[in-house]
Amino acid sequence: KSEMPQPVSIQDINHRVWVLQDQILIAVPRKDRVSPVTISLISCRHVETLEKDRGNPIYLGLNGLNLCLMCAKAGDQPTLQLKEKDIMDLYNQPEPVKSFLFYHSQSGRNSTFESVAFPGWFIAVSSEGGCPLILTQELGKANTTDFGLTMLF
């Protein structure tokens, strides 16, 4: 089991990358002047206490920025948020911190990220682009939930 976060770059099937804008992650087309964030991911060390068949439970952080992705309810709806958090602090906790955990599932070159706290809700980007990352239950419709990961370094 890795004990260091793995830096990755993420883009969707429409070649849009994740960019940090006013503390919000948005998906934009890759261009010369766009500087995508590097995502850090690390597997939960309590994997034996989480469901085995949904993917690899991981924490997702923004490399070097002390920000992590988490899911929280806003009214009735789970929302995707960035919280100031050291990914290693999450990793070392005595129990899985479910609000910050995602099941990473890979099929060929495509990856999905399903919220552990809200099963059935996936990280997604609107098909229009230039929009914030969201959580959705609607797979393969107006939102893209399939992403490509490239390991860095």
Epitope: E48, T49, L50, E51, K85, D89, N92, Q93, P94, E95, V97, K98, S99, A117
Partner: antibody, heavy 121, light 109 residues
Framework: EVQLQQSGAELVEPGASVKLSCTAS????????INWVKQRPEQGLEWIGR????????RYAPKFQGKATITSDTSSNTAYLQLSSLTSEDAAVYSC??????????????WGQGTTLTVSS | QAVVTQESALTTSPGETVTLTCRSS?????????ANWVQEKPDHLFTGLIG???NRAPGVPARFSGSLIGDKAALTITGAQTEDEAIYFC?????????FGGGTKLTVL
């Protein structure tokens, strides 16, 4: 209001089994970890184990493996502690507690009122 | 299994500062033990006070603080009040299970 309501006192014969309950109100047990602890007079607290009601996975203290079984029923928002092959050593007050993450830490935050188990023939 | 040791009893006066400690049989207590402190009042009324060594639970008065002092976890009550008379338990995390201490009976008179 968040509450953990535990079942009433039990008087059980040696060698038998008992199942204690802990019913939550004011929150969904799937959103927390439910822990069980044992307390005997003048002996402090002993952590027995915990369950994640969202998936049923459990952890136990080494001492209680084989003695205790923790289960949950999300439809009734209840966690259970079953103790088997009871002896006088198992006579104690058993309490349930939630373990929740706030901000940057886990806390044993909400507690049941305890269930007294007496083992006697 | 590790043994967690606390002072069996301490006495303080209202307004005074008192520190309770929590020692591990396996060596120095560190932040990786995620020390928790829990208060017990009569009739098995428990309240979680501190988690992760030094973080106060929501709603817990600021006079309660957690820290590491030397090789032990510590709970300090700054300006003790009569209602703080209780038994205080620490719990330490050891890789995959918690171990509670025997408790400290704090008398405030």
């Amino acid at each position: 209001e968040v509450q953990l309501q535990q079942s009433g006192a039990e008087l059980v014969e040696p060698g038998a089994s008992v199942k204690l309950s802990c019913t939550a109100s004011g929150f969904n047990i799937k959103d927390t970890y439910i822990n069980w602890v044992k307390q005997r007079p003048e002996q402090g607290l002993e952590w027995i184990g915990r369950i994640d009601p969202a998936n049923g996975y459990t952890r136990y203290a080494p001492k209680f493996q084989g003695k205790a079984t923790i289960t949950s029923d999300t439809s009734s928002n209840t966690a259970y502690l079953q103790l088997s092959s009871l002896t006088s050593e198992d006579a104690a007050v058993y309490s349930c507690s939630t373990l929740n993450y706030y901000g940057s830490s886990f806390f044993f935050d909400f507690w049941g009122q305890g269930t007294t188990l007496t083992v006697s023939s | 299994q590790a043994v967690v040791t606390q002072e069996s009893a301490l006495t303080t006066s209202p307004g005074e500062t008192v520190t309770l400690t929590c020692r591990s049989s396996t060596g120095a207590v560190t932040t990786s033990n995620y020390a928790n402190w829990v208060q017990e009042k009569p009739d098995h009324l428990f309240t979680g006070l501190i988690g992760g060594t030094n973080n106060r639970a929501p709603g817990v008065p600021a006079r309660f603080s957690g820290s590491l002092i030397g090789d032990k976890a510590a709970l300090t009550i700054t300006g003790a009040q009569t209602e703080d008379e209780a038994i205080y338990f620490c719990a330490l995390w050891y890789s995959n299970h918690w171990v509670f201490g025997g408790g400290t009976k704090l008398t405030v008179l």
